[in-house]
């Protein structure tokens, strides 16, 4: 008799999850020779731990503590690119200017970076078939729970000026809803971190107008300076040359705005 | 069985741009970091360069940066190695290599080598 | 970078003998060394990962030991295969780098 499996409203988990975790981890060590000491078998058990044979809408922060101390990985402080809903371009400037980074180039962000996992309670497996999604079913699932703490770690561990790449094109250029908006804008820490500064990437070619007067801009630069951090703002006119600026910026025409 | 297998060797003239393509099977190309060594006629080794596949990630040693591209195609399991404005002293035997899962960061796995000659 | 001096150059011993190569590192690479066997119009093969395990298939008489800065590659007992050249390899830090290699002929 086939045994009566919960159907979520999110896709299911992401096939190949145990071997694309594995194998991005062994990846990771390889590129990142500082982070060799991490035994990747480990890793996978502690994150296996973190929602195996447990509810997918009762996951805890405590239950990725493991995985956590496991991936315990130093960053420059003053070197933290945060983003909301811009990845690929933050994932692009940081390839160029290998000094920053955002979380995705850290071991556990790396891991996890576009996956999709959950359990069942009491059985030892994995959920294929769907997964919880954070609106229409629970919050306190183990991806969104996973998310929630490495950002907030992320974001404790940020020191002077940290940056944050906004992407000028949707409605809401800041969300408070998002993960930037939710957790690290609250998790930065005053007595460590001097200022915040936003680029507000501009999405089409003859968008002049100054996206850091946006409302949702300001609001944002009012929640920063109630946490007494000091805020600015930059548009960055031309992502494409912006770019091409960070790996050429001897270039005659980086001069002028980008 | 994991192999490489690496596309056939060229002959360029100086200033010329040449790009080896290294097919890969028995494995899941996104599962490992892909590596490029340089042999200069009856020399040494030397790495150039590495990819992750999964992201296009890539580092270039500092001797190569500017003139070395490493890109990879994941519909066709297929890293790529460019080098270009060739000169006589890029004449040399150019392989793709990777580590293995029992071997630390050694490389179990090579292409069979591409040889690029580079003469007027 | 660091650098890989390895020692000798070249060789000649006679079949049955006890063969030790060299490498020094430029600075610490904790065990991070592999030793490769490279025969002429072929890729290099890898014999040594992490500066003595012996890679899967690779005879007893291919050995390696050291750890830091200094490096040994040894074969026990020479045998007329082994003719070929050998290569240390750091891979501790990026970029990699090899040794110059060592040359082994038959006497």
């Known amino acids: 008799v086939p045994r009566w499996r919960q159907q979520w409203s999110g896709p299911g988990t992401t096939k190949r999850f145990p071997e694309t975790v594995l194998a991005r981890c062994v990846k990771y060590t390889e590129i990142h020779p500082e982070m060799r000491h991490v035994d990747c078998q480990s890793v996978w058990d502690a994150f296996k731990g973190a929602f195996i044979s447990k509810h997918p809408c009762n996951i805890t922060e405590e239950d990725y503590q493991p995985l956590m101390k496991l991936g315990t990985q130093t960053v420059p402080c003053n070197k933290i690119l945060l983003w909301s809903r811009i990845k690929d371009l933050a994932h692009q400037f940081t390839q160029v200017q290998r000094d920053m980074f955002t979380l995705e180039d850290t071991l556990l962000g790396y891991l996890a970076d576009d996956l999709t996992w959950c359990g069942e309670f009491n059985t030892s497996k994995i959920n294929y078939q769907s997964c919880p999604d954070w609106r229409k079913d629970c919050s306190n699932n183990p991806v969104s729970v996973f998310w929630k703490t490495v950002s907030r770690r992320f974001a404790e561990a940020a020191c002077d000026v940290v940056h944050v790449m906004l992407n000028g094109s949707r409605s809401k250029i800041f969300d408070k809803n998002s993960t930037f908006g939710s957790v690290e804008v609250h998790n930065l820490q005053p007595e460590k971190v001097q200022t915040l500064e936003a680029w507000v990437i501009h999405g089409g070619r003859e968008d002049s107008r100054d996206l850091c007067q946006d409302p949702t801009i300001k609001e944002l630069e009012s929640i920063i300076s109630k946490r007494n951090i000091q805020f600015s703002c930059k548009n960055i006119y031309r992502p494409d040359k912006f770019l091409q600026c960070v790996k050429n910026p001897e270039d005659s025409s980086c001069t002028s705005e980008i | 069985e994991v192999q490489l297998v690496q596309s056939g060797a060229e002959v360029k003239k100086p200033g010329a741009t040449v790009k080896i393509s290294c097919k890969v099977s028995?494995?899941?190309?996104?599962?490992?970091?892909m590596n490029w060594v340089q042999q200069h006629p009856g020399k040494g080794l030397e790495w150039m360069g590495w990819i992750d596949p999964e992201y296009g990630r890539t580092d270039v040693a500092e001797k190569f940066q500017g003139r070395v591209t490493i890109t990879a195609d994941t519909s066709t399991d297929t890293a790529y190695m460019e080098l270009s404005s060739l000169r006589s002293e890029d004449t040399a035997v150019y392989y793709c290599a990777r580590t293995g899962y029992n071997s630390g960061y050694g490389f179990p796995y090579w292409g069979q080598g591409t040889t690029v000659t580079v003469s007027s | 970078d660091i650098q890989m001096t390895q020692s000798p150059s070249s060789l000649s011993a006679s079949v049955g003998d006890r063969v030790t190569i060299t490498c020094k590192a430029s600075q610490n690479v904790d065990s991070d060394v592999d030793w490769y066997q490279q025969k002429p119009g072929k890729a290099p093969k890898l014999l040594i990962y992490?500066?003595?395990n012996r890679y899967t298939g690779v005879p007893s008489r291919f050995s390696g030991s050291g750890s830091g800065t200094d490096f040994t590659f040894t074969i026990s007992s020479l045998q007329p295969e082994d003719i070929a050249t050998y290569y240390c390899m750091q891979s501790n830090t990026h970029p990699r780098t090899f040794g110059g290699g060592t040359k082994v002929e038959i006497k």
């Open positions: 992490k500066a003595s």
């Open positions: 028995g494995y899941t190309f996104t599962d490992s970091v």
